[in-house]
Amino acid sequence: EDELQVIQPEKSVSVAAGESATLRCAMTSLIPVGPIMWFRGAGAGRELIYNQKEGHFPRVTTVSELTKRNNLDFSISISNITPADAGTYYCVKFRKGSPDDVEFKSGAGTELSVRAKPS
């Protein structure tokens, strides 16, 4: 039986300041049960970029509709990119836990670089 894989197809994405960046992520299975979150950076100091369940992320939209059934596409778009957004973004699958969810598998990461705004 194939274990779930987290696929981030682009190793890097370059976006002009002020534009939107699309970070792609797909899962190969609906199970194990548990949420998907996006982070910038790795390790203890990583920054949460998107979690559908909790938090307010006004610049982030999901590429697939939130009401799509049995969705395997967890790509996001970040609007109004600035140089401060540069970094490596990870799509992470968690296994449902009680009380806390446990990190199950991470994508390989996508490095976002920000170009100067065209004049």
Epitope: E1, I31, P32, V33, K53, T67, N71, R95
Partner: antibody, heavy 120, light 108 residues
Framework: DVQLVESGGGVVRPGESLRLSCAAS????????MTWVRQAPGEGLEWVST??????YYADSVKGRFTISRDNSKNTLYLQMNSLRAEDTAVYYC???????????????WGLGTLVTVSS | EIVLTQSPATLSVSPGERATFSCRAS??????LAWYQQRPGQAPRLLIY???IRETGIPERFSGSGSGTEFTLTITSLQSEDFAVYYC??????????FGGGTKVEIK
């Protein structure tokens, strides 16, 4: 067409064991979480247990007594019920989980159920 | 554990009339709520998910609304096959998945 067929119900005495099975067809069984829900006579619905791949979840009322498992090669879901009590008497339904995008699970297909009666 | 309270417990309606009943959650479940219909002697059937989306094959007379803690299921122009028990279920925070106690829609 998705089909879920439960079997294994029956009459047992308190403290005894029973193993329920649910044969699934019409979908890629190994890709979906599966759930057992029960309904005591004349009562509402009560979630019992859910299994993903290796991940299992139980209601407090059955934890330590019931074990959910699956055999993807046979497209079959199981519920091993030990130390049965009178309050476990119910129709047990097998259900296929479905998700909405980034959210949790609900149940889009149900079997017809199998009756478990625990009585001395 | 999130508690779902359905009201009324029983609703007496004449065929062709409109039926509206509610499901209240003890805490915010966003839109992570489903509705099921259970006819006598049958298994539950999914009607609505994500609070307002009709399952494939469910007639348009069924509609769901609400978000957060207050949800409503409405059946316009009740048909004979609609007389049944209706359950709500939350899937926002689990385990456990929780169901409401049900609303029985009976013929007036």
């Amino acid at each position: 067409d998705v089909q879920l067929v439960e079997s294994g119900g029956g009459v047992v005495r308190p403290g005894e064991s029973l193993r329920l099975s649910c044969a699934a067809s019409g979908f890629r069984f190994s890709n979906f979480a599966m759930t057992w829900v029960r309904q005591a006579p004349g009562e509402g619905l009560e979630w019992v247990s859910t299994i993903g791949s290796g991940d299992t979840y139980y209601a407090d009322s059955v934890k330590g007594r019931f074990t959910i498992s699956r055999d993807n090669s046979k497209n079959t879901l199981y519920l091993q019920m030990n130390s049965l009590r009178a309050e476990d008497t119910a129709v047990y339904y097998c259900a296929k989980d479905s998700t909405v995008s980034w959210s949790g699970d609900f149940f889009d297909y149900w079997g017809l159920g199998t009756l478990v009666t625990v009585s001395s | 554990e999130i508690v779902l309270t359905q009201s009324p417990a029983t609703l007496s309606v004449s065929p062709g009339e409109r039926a509206t009943f509610s499901c209240r959650a003890s805490q915010n479940v966003k839109n992570d709520l489903a509705w099921y219909q259970q006819r006598p002697g049958q298994a539950p059937r999914l009607l609505i998910y994500a609070a307002r989306i009709r399952e494939t094959g469910i007639p348009e007379r069924f509609s769901g609304s609400g978000s957060g803690t207050e949800f409503t299921l409405t059946i316009t122009s009740l048909q004979s096959e609609d007389f049944a028990v209706y359950y709500c279920q939350q899937y926002y925070d689990w385990p456990p998945f929780t169901f409401g106690g049900g609303t029985k829609v009976e013929i007036k």
